[in-house]
């Protein structure tokens, strides 16, 4: 029979191949039907009968047309530091991604095995490189003329405000404090106010990183804080 009108199972022509969504069964030496996603081969084909497919059992899946005897097991439930971005169904594996404020510290073939909390830069240090799906925050000391007074995984070092008269000089962890030069705003001569800059400056803040989109599976490994690095705090 010509291949295009043959019904499975059929013997392929010499040197020929089986059609789309069919496979060559070595035992039967026939082209046989594959099973659709969400199913598996319950009974393999013979020379006279085609593949018998059955639905995947609970918590298992097949994503492709196949002739596997058993569906693949879905990954473990997502751990508390992860978000389930794709549920386990008959046709797809569960996907767990790191929740906001976390990154993938230990990846695996299909995504994340272990999430870890993003490093927080302590006062006097700002974010040099923001965290990504797969990398931690890098902190750096605030350069002269800049400061950070927060413990944050997103804040960068910001410039000190510029004062006509400085009451308290700024340092790496504190903004400069200006002396008031406007008597109408002053409660007492030379009173210190927080703050009254001459020139405004834009707030240099980083947006919070989006959660990781690397697919993965929780392996229920213990998750502790990331090891402290210079200028970081392990919360």
């Amino acid at each position: 029979l010509p291949a295009q009108v043959a019904f499975t199972p059929y013997a392929p022509e010499p040197g020929g191949t089986c059609r789309l969504r069919e496979y060559y069964d070595q035992t039967a030496q026939m082209c046989c039907s594959k099973c659709p996603p969400g199913q598996h081969a319950k009974v393999f084909c013979t020379k006279t009968s085609d593949t018998v497919c059955d639905s995947c059992e609970d918590s298992t899946y097949t994503q492709l047309w196949n002739w596997v005897p058993e569906c693949l097991s879905c990954g473990s439930r997502c751990s508390s530091d992860q978000v389930e971005t794709q549920a386990c169904t008959r046709e797809q594996n569960r996907i767990c991604t790191c929740r906001p404020g976390w990154y993938c510290a230990l990846s695996k073939q299909e995504g994340c095995r272990l999430c870890a909390q993003l490093r927080k830069c302590r006062p006097g240090f700002g974010v040099a490189r923001p965290g990504t799906e797969t990398s931690d925050v890098v902190c750096k000391p605030c350069a002269p003329g800049t400061f950070s007074n927060t413990t944050s995984s997103t804040d960068i070092c910001r410039p000190h405000q510029i004062c006509h008269v400085v009451a308290i000089p700024g340092n790496a962890s504190m903004d400069a404090v200006c002396t008031s030069t406007s008597p109408t705003r002053s409660m007492a001569p030379g009173a210190v106010h927080l703050p009254q800059p001459v020139s405004t400056r834009s707030q240099h803040t980083q947006p919070t990183p989006a959660p990781s989109t690397a697919p993965g599976t929780s392996f229920l490994l213990p998750v502790g804080p990331s090891p402290p690095a210079e200028g970081s705090t392990g919360d």
């Epitope: 918590s59 097991s73 879905c74 439930r77 549920a87 008959r90 229920l220």
Partner: antibody, heavy 120, light 108 residues
């Protein structure tokens, strides 16, 4: 919120049949299984079977092979378990419970139970 | 069928005690498919630990679960009055799915 509400207590004679219902609310019946588990007085839990309400596919302990029938009515989100040829040892509280597909069979919500008494 | 055997069948303990319940399967069970339920008299069972070691929301952190293969345990680090109940292990690895016979935790 998720609720499973079962039908009331039944008293049956040996040889009769009983049909227990379990109405689900607060969740989509898609991608879940509904199980039936029973507990004889003073005894442990015994799994009877389960149904996929969306497809009507069932699976049960071979022990109940010829006596149990599980059905579902998707229009009312209700599943039913019928046990025939009742005997005294079928006296038990019958529970329905759900397990979401992908949760490895963990039954996270249970009905309040239906006491079935088989007595002549 | 996979038989699930719990030990002890019952135990008496005091508030504050550390309690361990074991569940032994007659053949290997994947840890994802091993669950524990708590049941109090006249009430329906409640899912207490899922997939060997995970606590559903609302279950106190004094409960923990561990194990693999054929041996699994439920541990209560410091027994509280509300923990007195019967605990059942349950395997969903192979049909027919089976429960242990239960372990009743009573007040000493």
């Amino acid at each position: 919120q998720v609720q499973l509400v079962q039908s009331g207590a039944e008293v049956k004679k040996p040889g009769a049949s009983v049909k227990v219902s379990c109405k689900a609310s607060g969740f989509n019946n898609k991608d879940i299984y509904m199980h039936w588990v029973r507990q004889a007085p003073g005894q442990g839990l015994e799994w009877i079977g389960r149904i996929d309400p969306a497809t009507g596919n069932t699976k049960h302990d071979p022990k109940f092979q010829d006596r149990v029938t599980m059905t579902s009515d998707t229009s009312t989100n209700t599943v039913y378990m019928e046990l025939s040829s009742l005997r005294s040892e079928d006296t038990a509280v019958y529970y329905c419970a759900r397990s979401p597909y992908g949760d490895f069979g963990a039954m996270d919500y249970w009905g309040q139970g239906t006491l079935v008494t088989v007595s002549s | 069928d996979i038989q699930m055997t719990q030990s002890p069948s019952s135990l008496s303990a005091s508030v504050g005690d550390r309690v361990t319940i074991t569940c032994t399967a007659s053949s290997s069970v994947s840890s994802n498919y091993l669950h524990w339920y708590q049941q109090k008299p006249g009430k329906a069972p409640k899912l207490w630990i899922y997939s060997t070691s995970n606590l559903p929301s609302g279950v106190p952190s004094r409960f923990s679960g561990s194990g693999s293969g054929t041996d699994f345990t439920l541990t209560i680090s410091s027994l509280q009055p509300e923990d007195f109940a019967t605990y059942y292990c349950h395997q969903y690895h192979r049909s027919p799915w089976t429960f242990g016979q239960g372990t009743k935790v009573e007040i000493k």
